[in-house]
Amino acid sequence: KKEDGESTAPTPRPKVLRCKCHHHCPEDSVNNICSTDGYCFTMIEEDDSGLPVVTSGCLGLEGSDFQCRDTPIPHQRRSIECCTERNECNKDLHPTLPPLKNRDFVDGPIHHR
């Protein structure tokens, strides 16, 4: 477990992990399967017209700790889930969009106008 403020590099996996990829397939993927030394992920986010878009794929070990932490971004509804327990584990991830806050109803139309 990392202590607060500590920045130890994540431990490399002993073997490559295969993940399903959709809307997020790198050039070296084959048949919608990518390979990584880090995590599989599935993410849901709103597109510009407010429709939910699901993407999935591979996250490299570098920086994936931060990306998988799913810190909220103001005015951006999105959620990400990561896994490593088996190949294509992200097929079974189903993140949901965080609920709309009251402020979003007010800011929303102005933001998208």
Epitope: V16, R18, D28, V30, D37, G60
Partner: antibody
Amino acid sequence: QVQLQQPGAELVKPGASVKLSCKASGYTFTSYWMQWVKQRPGQGLEWIGEIDPSDSYTLYNQKFKGKATLTVDTSSSTAYMQLSSLTSEDSAVYFCARFGYYIEYWGQGTTLTVSS
Amino acid sequence: DVVMTQTPLSLPVSLGDQASISCRSSQSLVHSTGNTYLHWYLQKPGQSPKLLIYKVSNRFSGVPDRFSGSGSGTDFTLKISRVEAEDLGVYFCSQSTHVPFTFGSGTKLEIK
């Protein structure tokens, strides 16, 4: 030390099937992929496919789909490759190999001869 | 499939000489993670291949420092600084960036 034990030779008739074995020792079997590679004299090395013993997930070279089937028995730390509908083209040395991000260790290989 | 082209096919050397083997890939071997999965193996007659160099330039455990690897993208080189009798055999390059993984056709290092 890491060891991958394979039978030295197999002789089978055309049209038959054969199941080649590879017994792993000296490491945690489920922590690495097992790959299979074909070598024919003067034809170099060909990657057949791989299996992750932790979840039996497989990836195959398209060329060997329908020809090779990879399985594992984690209780005995043994990987298997079944080859079906054998022809003289399948006569070769078949290696199993431990793979993380690259092949680190190879078995000694099984020489498969397909002949009537 | 990624084609790995090795040159030369045969490399006659005198013991103590430097040897250099080239390996070119038909597409970039830089993986989406940033790693380059290009490796070198030596196969002696009647034996299985042994790993020498992994990820372009990293010597595998127990491999003498007279072996070195270099290159990037699609162009890679294995150098043996002073060839010894035990170095003779067939050298293969291999890539594990793209499925299916592929191998070079081999370079036979032999005594001149």
